[in-house]
Interface confidence: low
């Protein structure tokens, strides 16, 4: 018996969106027990029909899809997972993380979590959308355009994989989309910045100019800053990001957005992998999500937080990193940057928990949608009570009480914020002073989670 579907396209809703959302959520929750038996949370694997668009090892690339026939929203998520930039570290990656280089062992289904969940409780933002998860198997930050050959041991086709997935999805209902949101985490987040304009251009050329293409870049806004301790470019993790990308682009035959490429000389295209340099050149609206103290950024900067208390030099370096990142986001109107030590957020099940200035990420994304919808009516002012620029201003890691739990990397134990800050070498007097508080008051506030 085919299930009747009720198209709910929120982009068409005028007036009190919050009240409407509350009613829909209530309706969904009341209907949920009846339909729980039929609900299938899984996204199903489709390997690309065009088998010349491949993963590193020549196996066909693909995507996982869960259709939502009543919706004209499509969410395409780019997976992350570092990269490799020479024969040796790609060989090593192939031997230790093969699913990031080959489709041969991919499971037939995946569960959608976080922003990919179809449960309104877990995904109050876009639970009704068509969900697409594109596994990362090109190791090139979604930028490559070279196939496997006698000369090339591996294919690097990240940019081409995205184009081919979009092409195939047009035959599966994407052609009727109103909004395509290209999202991604970590290397996938950087992949969004590198590919969002190209996807918009592709759809225009194929005759779908009405599809609004937007980007959501999570944990992919990196800085080409000075490492805490400089190390030679030996492996993926210790190599300075500028050097790794410089080498990678040549190895992958990497492509960057045209408008950004024109801003830099030949051989300097690596600059376009860094959010604060590529963002001003993008035409599509992009929402940037970035922890101010991103663990992957710290890793490439050679900061490894062990069980030992942090030395003052390192503490200042970490604080300065947060300051620099905050500065790069000042002209990014749609951004969500909590002062936490973490990495990735949007496909975590508890992605709704973190707040900046009292606003959660799904709420901020909803406000962003509204602002884009309203901007067609030439209104450029931020919506009252619906903020989209949310960057923490407090200056140390986990000064935001809604940050995800920190674990002591040495013992694996959960730490409360006061413990964590002392562990980081922060003197409570120093932390309390700028807030105009006594250390005892601050400790009280932190342990109460306020």
């Amino acid at each position: 018996q085919p299930v009747e579907s009720f198209p709910l396209d929120f982009t068409a809703v005028e007036g009190n969106m919050d009240s409407f959302m509350a009613q829909v959520k209530s309706l969904a929750q009341s209907l949920y027990p009846c339909s729980a038996q039929q609900l299938n949370e899984d996204l199903r694997l489709h390997l690309l029909l065009n088998t010349s668009v491949t993963c590193n090892d020549g196996s066909p690339a693909g995507y996982y899809l869960k259709e939502s026939r009543g919706s004209r929203r499509w969410l395409l998520f780019l997976e992350g997972g570092w990269y490799c930039f020479n024969r040796e570290n790609c060989d090593s990656r192939y031997d230790t993380m093969r699913r990031l280089m080959s489709s041969r062992d991919w499971p037939r289904t995946r569960t959608g979590t976080g922003i990919l969940s179809s449960q309104p409780e877990e995904n109050p933002y876009w639970w009704n959308a068509n969900m697409v998860f594109i596994p990362y198997c090109s190791s090139d930050v979604w930028s490559g355009a070279s196939s496997k050959s006698e000369k090339n041991e591996y294919a690097f086709m990240g940019a081409l994989i995205i184009q081919e997935v979009v092409r195939e999805l047009l035959g599966r209902g994407l052609s009727g989309a109103k909004v395509l949101l290209l999202a991604g985490s970590s290397a996938g987040g950087t992949g969004v910045l590198l590919n969002v304009d190209r996807v918009a251009e592709q759809l225009e050329k194929l005759g779908y100019p009405a599809i609004q293409v937007r980007g959501l870049a999570d944990s992919g806004w990196f800085l080409d800053n000075k490492q805490y301790r400089h190390t030679d470019c030996v492996d993926t993790i210790t190599c300075a990001p500028t050097e790794a990308i410089r080498r990678g682009i040549r190895y992958w035959n990497g492509v960057v957005p045209e408008r950004c490429r024109r801003q830099f000389q030949e051989g300097e295209e690596w600059n376009c992998f860094f959010g604060y340099k590529v963002y001003p050149t993008l035409r599509c609206p992009v929402f940037v999500v970035q922890w101010l103290f991103d663990e992957a950024q710290l890793t490439v900067d050679n900061v490894h937080l062990t069980g030992q208390p942090v030395q003052e030099g390192l503490r200042l370096y970490i604080q300065n990193l947060g300051r620099e990142l905050r500065h790069t986001l000042k002209d990014v109107p749609a951004s969500f940057a909590p002062a936490c030590l973490s990495h990735e957020i949007i496909i975590r099940s508890h992605w709704t928990d973190v707040q900046v200035k009292g606003t959660s990420l799904p709420r901020a994304l909803h406000c962003w949608d509204r602002s884009l919808h309203d901007s067609h009516k030439a209104s450029k002012t931020p919506l009252k009570g619906c903020p989209v620029h949310l960057v923490d201003s407090c200056p140390w890691p986990h000064c935001n009480p809604s940050c995800p739990t920190v674990r002591d990397q040495f013992t694996g134990q959960e730490m409360n914020v006061a413990q964590f800050l002392m562990h980081m070498g922060f003197d409570m007097q120093t932390v309390a002073q700028p807030q105009g508080l006594e250390p005892s008051e601050l400790l009280g506030m932190l342990s109460n989670g306020s």
Epitope: W82, E88, D91, Y94, D95, T96, R98, R99, Q409
Partner: antibody
Framework: EVQLVESGGGLVKPGGSLKLSCAAS????????MHWFRQAPEKGLEWVAY????????YYADTVKGRFTISRDNAKNTLSLQMTSLRSEDTAMYYC????????????WGTGTTVTVSS | DIVLTQSPASLAVSLGQRATISCRAS??????????MHWYQQKPGQPPKLLIY???NLESGVPARFSGSGSGTDFTLNIHPVEEEDAATYYC?????????FGSGTKLEIK
Amino acid sequence: EVQLVESGGGLVKPGGSLKLSCAASGFTFSDYGMHWFRQAPEKGLEWVAYISSGSRTVYYADTVKGRFTISRDNAKNTLSLQMTSLRSEDTAMYYCARKHYNGGYFDVWGTGTTVTVSS
Amino acid sequence: DIVLTQSPASLAVSLGQRATISCRASKIVSTSGYSYMHWYQQKPGQPPKLLIYLASNLESGVPARFSGSGSGTDFTLNIHPVEEEDAATYYCQHSRELPPTFGSGTKLEIK
């Protein structure tokens, strides 16, 4: 059944040579990186050498570098360890092991072959 | 090279009780959400047998009384309830980088 079987061990004089083999069966050998380990009598496990699935990358422990050579023949499903300039401290049980490709742990081990270096 | 310090060197546990073995790495062996630490069991005259991979995942066919935990540099293998057949030497191993190294082993005796 997934299996690794070592052979070629024996008694050899210091300075001598020996070639160990490891025959793989029950799985697609060419898909896996392979390692050699050794264990001296009443001692712990020591890594000796590694070869990637397609022989593109090889690594050796400092203690054997320049004396031992790891190789593989994917057509014949065999892994080899050529040992030269043998020393008494090379005396051990030698194991070949399959490295699982998603995490670098060793999920299949051979039964071992004994190498004794003594005059 | 990463040094793995295993403790205790030997352990005697009564049948049905809990055995806890620790392994501390000289450097963090966790990255990008994975902890590259694994546990093996070895009985006399036999090769090592994989028990736990990536810190906490039970290898197929291994009884559920074996469990692993930890992240960063500190890892633990628990066996509960201990059975007669668990008498063996247990090794931790990291795969965070080459060379992969092993702990010095913990010999478990059943009382």
